[in-house]
């Protein structure tokens, strides 16, 4: 039961995380105009990965896409790539994890196959989360660097007569959405990996037992040639869980609202 819950929760957390990564990637507010130096601006600028926007005094917002590919900073391209890789891996991970869910039966799929799929999706979620966190962090670092550079430019070489207020950008909402979403995907992936350990059918660890047959003094160890390893073959059709061996019927779970997507 604990394994099913862990797997199910990992799936749901990852699903929320990936939805967040997609949302963050699409959001326009990766960087927003810093209002510290100009709190009374009637024209508010903010930028995303795909376009930059200006909200004017009338309340109208005009957004313009970055229609050039070669003219964009390499860092922005890298962030785009990281976020897209994160989304793709996450989406594949979600697809794999749906089939790996213990509460969903697909034909006569072996538990070992489900365990492998759970592990695969877990690893995909972890990498997806890391990609998102990395992408957002690279962008944040870029913002911090530019912020201090523009601050330095603001107060130098103008002889105290600063007429043009240079627009500085600070962290936008998308960065926080991305960090949280990446973290959730990462946690979901870890949970899937933990669930995988519980799903994997292990061999039962039997202690060597001495059988005293009449007229002979020979010690037999069950498991044939495996006797030397101390593991016997698990001949009964049971799954080995962290909490002990249980039959499949004992861990029957009822479908929850998260089981079918």
């Amino acid at each position: 039961m604990a394994v099913t819950a862990c797997q199910g929760l990992g799936f749901v957390v990852s699903l929320i995380g990936i939805a967040g990564i997609i949302a963050a990637t699409c959001m326009d507010q990766w960087s927003t105009q810093d209002l510290y130096n100009n709190p009374v601006t009637a024209v508010f600028n903010y930028q995303g990965l795909w376009r930059s926007c200006v909200r004017e005094s009338s309340g109208f917002t005009e957004c313009r896409g970055y229609f050039t590919l070669l003219g964009l900073p390499a860092m922005l391209q890298a962030v785009r790539a990281l976020m897209i890789v994160g989304i793709v891996l996450g989406a594949i991970g979600l697809l794999v994890s749906i089939f790996a869910l213990k509460c969903i039966r697909i034909g006569s799929m072996e538990d070992s196959a489900k365990a492998n799929m759970t592990l695969t999706s877990g690893i995909m979620f972890i990498v997806s989360g890391l990609c998102a966190i990395a992408g957002v962090s690279v962008f944040a670092n870029m913002l911090v660097t530019n912020f201090w550079m523009s601050t330095a430019n603001m107060y130098t070489g103008m002889g105290g007569m600063v007429q043009t207020v240079q627009t500085r950008y600070t962290f936008g909402a998308a960065l926080f959405v991305g960090w949280v979403a990446g973290g959730l995907t990462l946690i979901g992936g870890v949970m899937m990996c933990i669930a995988c350990r519980g799903l994997a059918p292990e061999e039962t660890n039997y202690k060597a037992v001495s059988y005293h047959a009449s007229g002979h003094s020979v010690a037999y160890k069950p498991g044939g040639f495996k006797a030397s390893t101390g593991f016997g073959s698990n001949t009964k059709n049971k799954k080995i869980y962290d909490g002990g061996a249980r039959t499949e019927d004992e861990v029957q779970s009822y479908p929850s609202k998260h089981d079918y997507v």
Epitope: A42, V43, V54, S57, G59
Partner: antibody, heavy 115, light 113 residues
């Protein structure tokens, strides 16, 4: 077509309050801020503030803070501007304006403050 | 607050002549986000509400005759009427649309000689 129709002229005594209405039509009311500007007789234009009909957010000119209140009624697409503690120098034509670059203005409401 | 200074206060020109109105702002109105100057020009005829002529310092509003043109960037702007017509008699205002409080120039009255 886009229209901003304002309420009629008002005559008020000093110390009183006036509430001017501005009914918008011909566009999505919540998409654009509604600003208020006044013009004293023979004088220039003075910005008073705005209201965002979408979320009721307001921003006022410091000069009028504490005296001006802007409200809206989305059901009738109407914005109200109330100016309190009226003085003789508040005698002016009050305009509401909206849309991009303030392409549309109301016809103006003359508020006369006299004892 | 950004101070908008218009000159001259009044201008008398003959029909068909060129009229030039200057507007200076105490701070730059150039928005680095889209490289646009947030300066607007309005025309106000006697007894009427102001009418939008030019936005972004140089973009003519639709329906405005092409004899009206705007130029300038940063802090110095100009409105030009290339060939003044009788219907152009009005007061012209420039407006800072970049920073609150939004501020207007004192106005320039254009008359026919």
């Amino acid at each position: 077509q886009v229209q901003l129709v304002q309420s009629g002229a008002e005559v008020k005594k000093p110390g009183a309050s006036v509430k001017v209405s501005c009914k918008a039509s011909g566009y999505t009311f919540t998409n654009y801020f509604v600003h208020w500007v006044r013009q004293a007789p023979g004088q220039g234009l003075e910005w008073m503030g705005y209201i965002n009909p979408y979320n009721d957010d307001t921003k006022y000119n410091e000069k009028f803070k504490g005296r001006v209140t802007m409200t809206r009624d989305t059901s009738t697409s109407t914005v109200y501007m109330e100016l309190s503690s009226l003085r003789s120098e508040d005698t002016a034509v009050y305009y509401c304006l909206s849309l991009r670059f303030f392409a549309y203005w109301g016809q103006g409401t003359l508020v006369t403050v006299s004892s | 607050d950004i101070v908008m200074t218009q000159s001259p206060d009044s201008l008398a020109v003959s029909l068909g002549e060129r009229a030039t109105i200057s507007c200076k702002s105490s701070q730059s109105l150039l928005n680095s986000g889209n490289q646009k100057n947030y300066l607007t020009w309005y025309q106000q005829k006697p007894g009427q509400a102001p009418k939008l002529l030019i936005y972004w310092a140089s973009t003519r509003e639709s329906g405005v005759p092409d004899r009206f043109s705007g130029s300038g960037s940063g802090t110095d702007f100009t409105l030009t009427i290339s060939s003044v017509q009788a219907e152009d008699v009005a007061v012209y205002f420039c407006q800072n649309d970049y920073s609150y409080p939004l501020t207007f120039g004192g106005g320039t009255k254009v008359e026919i000689k």
